[in-house]
Structures are given as C-alpha cells and as structure tokens.
C-alpha cells in the first residue's frame, strides 16, 4: 500500500507515534517519506547483505528476520515480511523499540539527512488529525 501523506499521519497518530519519546508526528511522517515514499512494500538491499523493509525501512541485520541475513539479531522478534503489511502495526511497534535506544531517530539515515532540524510540522500541515 502507498499511503497518502495525511492518511499516514492519521495512521501513525492512531498507533501512538505522535510525541513518542519526544518525537512529534511530523518527524515520523517525514522519515517515512524519505525512507519509503510512503510505500509499505518498499524493500532495499544493502551492501552488507541486509535488507531494509517497509514504510520505515527497518533493517534485517538488527530488527527483523528475513532468513537470509547472516547474524541477524531480530531485536523486534518478527519476520521481516510483517513489515511489508498495509497494516503498519508491526512497523510502528518495531520503530518504537528502535527509537528507545540511545540514538533516537538518528537510527534512520533519511531522517538524519532530510528531516532533522527542518520544519517537520509541514508534513502534517492541512491534515485532519
């Protein structure tokens, strides 16, 4: 599923991401835009053999199990396929664990490079939330 901007904002708010661990909803929508272009089925292979999955491009080296990433930690205890669902519950639950580590949202390269320090509230402007 490819979400609309406001549709995703509403879904993320419903799943408890607004101000989760101090990160406003705009941060999460912005991250999703530049990680996956709002596409829940986005996958991208990395040079180390791991793969990033779903709307928040969660990595198989650390967070999920895809059966083909050597030494995967699977810290979210889920199959990576669960991160490709049109239901973003698994991606959000896992993202909450990721952001609860010391690096916060810096764990997402796209957030760090494209969203951090910008007017992220623009990503939810005009949305009925």
């Amino acid at each position: 599923k490819v979400f609309g901007r406001c549709e995703l904002a509403a879904a993320m708010k419903r799943h408890g991401l607004d101000n989760y661990r101090g990160y406003s909803l705009g941060n999460w929508v912005c991250a999703a835009k530049f990680e996956s272009n709002f596409n829940t089925q986005a996958t991208n292979r990395n040079t180390d053999g791991s793969t990033d999955y779903g709307i928040l491009q969660i990595n198989s080296r650390w967070w999920c199990n895809d059966g083909r990433t050597p030494g995967s930690r699977n810290l979210c205890n889920i199959p990576c396929s669960a991160l490709l669902s049109s239901d973003i519950t698994a991606s959000v639950n896992c993202a909450k664990k990721i952001v609860s580590d010391g690096n916060g949202m810096n764990a997402w390269v796209a957030w760090r490079n494209r969203c951090k320090g910008t007017d992220v509230q623009a990503w939810i402007r005009g949305c009925r939330l």
Partner: antibody, heavy 113, light 107 residues
Amino acid sequence: DVELQESGPSLVKPSQTLSLTCSVTGDSITRGYWSWIRKFPGNKLEYMGYISYSGSTFYNPSLKSRISITRDTFKNQLYLQLNSVTTEDTATYYCAEYDGTYWGQGTTVTVSS
Amino acid sequence: DILMTQTPATLSVTPGDSVSLSCRASQSIGNNLHWFQQKSHESPRLLIKYASQSISGIPSRFSGSGSGTDFTLSINTVETEDFGMYFCQQSNSWPYTFGGGTKLEIK
C-alpha cells in the same frame, strides 16, 4: 523460553550500596532491552531504568545519580547498583525484558540497620 | 512525569461477572499503554500491549481499549484465576510510569 533470575543480598544497611544480578537464560542479552523495576510495600511499582541491546542506559530521574545498570555479555547477566540506600528503598526488585513479556521472580531487599 | 491513575482501587466481583478497569493518564500517551496482572507472590504478567493488542497465551476474555488519556481493560466473564492486582503502565515518555493498581477481589 527466556528465563530471568535475580540474586543478591536480602538485607542492606542504610547508606550502603544495593547490588543485584539478573541471570538470563534462553536468549542473549545482546538481543534485547532489559529493565529493572521495583515494587514497594503497598503495591506501588517504579520503573527504575533499562539497558538496550547497544548498551545505552536510561535511568529514572527520581533516582538521580544513585543508579547504575550494567551488563556482562559473556556471562549473560545484568546488574543493578543503587547507592546510598535508605529505608525507602525497601522493595521487591524485578528484572524484566523491556517489552514486559518476561520477568524474573523478584527478590525482596530490606534496607535496615 | 506522566501520572497514571487507576480506578477503582478495589473491585469486588462474582465469578461470571464482566468487569471494566479504568486507567487515566495525566497527558496524552497515544496508544502507549500496557496492562499487567499480578497475583500474590507472583511476577507481573503482560495481558495487553499498546492499549488493545493481544498477547499470545492470554485468554481472549481480556481485552483493552482507549487512546490518548483514557483506557479500559475489560474482562468478559471473570474466572476465579483472574483475581489479583491489575496495573497499567505508559511507555510514551521516559520515565515510564505505572498506575497505582486495581485489586480485583471475590465478592
């Protein structure tokens, strides 16, 4: 299945340091986030802090600089240190997997002279 | 810190009744609310995560609802093994905090 087991002295004198160990079996502690939670007499629960897979620690500000959570990845053990204890620190101390799925059986620590 | 308030403090019910336990947060916490059961001399057991998400191995008579500041744990047809303490916990903002608990006791 994952099992957690707390151990340490059941009696600590005021002003001393409370030191507890949590031994984890069934999973590597580098594959998770691990918490220390305590329950006071009268049922109040307090989330003391946690340590992440990367070794990052988060401490409850109410415990200020008294608390330290560390780990030994080779022994697969977690440690809690609480300095300068008072009688108010008398509680049952639990280590738990961060998601709340797995808990130790708890160990009761009394602070008394 | 976010203050979690549980009501009532004690709930007296007869096995077979259906009950609702309330938990209120002092500020919005989205769906970042978890429910635990603790019986005497036992460790807490996770019943519901993220307000309404079920947990493997937990009987289906337990369900959760709510978002923002007001949350409810429902037990559909209470069984004798359900008596004990129930706690809610928020994980929206650090430090995570627990409610004071509701004691479910036999009438």
